[in-house]
């Protein structure tokens, strides 16, 4: 008789999760010479230890501490790009602008990007059937706590001018409940960060509105200003042209506003 298993509302652990994490770690450390000293088996052991045999609604940041420590790396603190609800463009940007980094350009972010995982209390099994959904089940689940932990540390490390890419097509361009709005904004260090510069990415080709005047952007400006960090905002009217101009900045069409 099969043992009763908790049914959660979210998708189960990504198939071949252990193999994927280990393979990503090996690939990352091969591509990034400064991370060659990292023992990927230890990284996997730390990752696994954070959620295996634990109730998937009772995960804490402390559970991820060994992984955070083993995966710590040097990222230029003045080259950090945060994003909210516009991951693909942010990643396309850092693939071209190689000296800038999103969280997913770091080892820990790269390992977990687009993956789901959870275990079960008191068994060493990984749950491939279902995992807790943040809204319907619980917020202290393995995936949510992981991203909260790495996002906090990433924001804490930032300095000078920090950039954030925001999706101008959404009803809430700045969403207080996003990881950026609930974690990263509050963990920028005012003694290190001088300015937060928002890039609002427009969706429609004919959209010429100044989305920097959007009420949610004003709300972001207020939160940032209260934290003694300066705020600036730029409209990116043509994201396709924006990327093209990052690739070829000397192109004559790149002097006009994008």
């Amino acid at each position: 008789v099969p043992r009763w298993r908790q049914q959660w509302s979210g998708p189960g652990t990504t198939k071949r999760f252990p193999e994927t994490v280990l393979a990503r770690c090996v690939k990352y450390t091969e591509i990034h010479p400064e991370m060659r000293h990292v023992d990927c088996q230890s990284v996997w052991d730390a990752f696994k230890g954070a959620f295996i045999s634990k109730h998937p609604c009772n995960i804490t940041e402390e559970d991820y501490q060994p992984l955070m420590k083993l995966g710590t790396q040097t990222v230029p603190c003045n080259k950090i790009l945060l994003w909210s609800r516009i991951k693909d463009l942010a990643h396309q940007f850092t693939q071209v602008q190689r000296d800038m980094f999103t969280l997913e350009d770091t080892l820990l972010g790269y390992l977990a990007d687009d993956l789901t995982w959870c275990g079960e209390f008191n068994t060493s099994k990984i749950n491939y059937q279902s995992c807790p959904d943040w809204r319907k089940d619980c917020s202290n689940n393995p995936v949510s706590v992981f991203w909260k932990t790495v996002s906090r540390r990433f924001a804490e490390a930032a300095c000078d001018v920090v950039h954030v890419m925001l999706n101008g097509s959404r009803s809430k361009i700045f969403d207080k409940n996003s990881t950026f709005g609930s974690v990263e904004v509050h963990n920028l260090q005012p003694e290190k960060v001088q300015t937060l510069e928002a890039w609002v990415i427009h969706g429609g080709r004919e959209d010429s509105r100044d989305l920097c005047q959007d009420p949610t952007i004003k709300e972001l400006e207020s939160i940032i200003s209260k934290r003694n960090i300066q705020f600036s905002c730029k409209n990116i009217y043509r994201p396709d042209k924006f990327l093209q101009c990052v690739k070829n900045p000397e192109d004559s069409s790149c002097t006009s506003e994008i």
Epitope: E34, H37, S42, D45, G49, P66, K69, T72, R153, A157
Partner: antibody
Framework: QVQLVQSGAEVKKPGSSVKVSCKAS????????IEWVRQAPGQGLEWMGD????????DYNEKFKGRVTITADESTSTAYMELSSLRSEDTAVYYC??????????WGQGTLVTVSS | DIQMTQSPSSLSASVGDRVTITCSAS??????LGWYQQKPGKAPKLLIY???NLHTGVPSRFSGSGSGTDFTLTISSLQPEDFATYYC?????????FGQGTKVEIK
């Protein structure tokens, strides 16, 4: 080969501060955590805190929060541990060590700090 | 804080003896345990990391085992240079904590 060389012995008055240095060589300084551990005379080992020199990440033992500051100078591959508001029970040998797989693989020779009026 | 309890606190043994030291953690520390040897007036030296991995240059007579809460350091055949104090240390969570030490003395 990996080496951690610490500054010399210090005698300090109660209430003052001490700053111990730890110069690293033989590896990439910015890629590894530096741990600080102390040992009072005839006693066991006590972890104080650590730093990741490449990113400036620090973590401290709550017992020393507010009294200990750990810093690092990448240009000289040197880590520092400063302990303030010294009291007689801070008399100990202070060690730096390099972090490896959540253990400490290479240690400095130790710095004796004596707190006495 | 995670408490690390070593036993015994001291032991007397002869050259050639098999010696076992145990370390118990007050909560699950997975495999994040190190073992150190310290001689009087010297800095500790890492013997074993990640519960069972032998550190570079450490003789193979030293071995470690265990995971979760219970760990063991074994010296298969005690040598004269092995008389020292041995400490375990957990790296699972801050603050890192050490056992109180086990002194291995000559019988």
């Amino acid at each position: 080969q990996v080496q951690l060389v610490q500054s010399g012995a210090e005698v300090k008055k109660p209430g003052s501060s001490v700053k111990v240095s730890c110069k690293a060589s033989g590896y990439t300084f910015t890629n590894h955590w530096i741990e600080w551990v102390r040992q009072a005379p005839g006693q066991g080992l006590e972890w104080m805190g650590d730093i990741f020199p490449g990113g400036g990440y620090t973590d401290y033992n709550e017992k020393f929060k507010g009294r200990v500051t750990i810093t690092a100078d990448e240009s000289t591959s040197t880590a520092y541990m400063e302990l303030s508001s010294l009291r007689s029970e801070d008399t100990a040998v202070y060690y730096c060590a390099r972090g490896r797989d959540l253990a400490m693989d290479y240690w400095g020779q130790g710095t004796l700090v004596t707190v006495s009026s | 804080d995670i408490q690390m309890t070593q036993s015994p606190s001291s032991l007397s043994a002869s050259v050639g003896d098999r010696v076992t030291i145990t370390c118990s953690a007050s909560q699950n520390i997975n495999v994040w345990l190190g073992w150190y040897q310290q001689k009087p007036g010297k800095a500790p030296k890492l013997l074993i990391y990640k519960a069972s991995n032998l550190h570079t240059g450490v003789p193979s007579r030293f071995s470690g085992s265990g995971s979760g809460t219970d760990f063991t350091l074994t010296i298969s055949s005690l040598q004269p240079e092995d008389f020292a104090t041995y400490y375990c240390q957990q790296g699972q969570s801050y603050p890192y904590t050490f056992g109180q030490g086990t002194k291995v003395e000559i019988k």
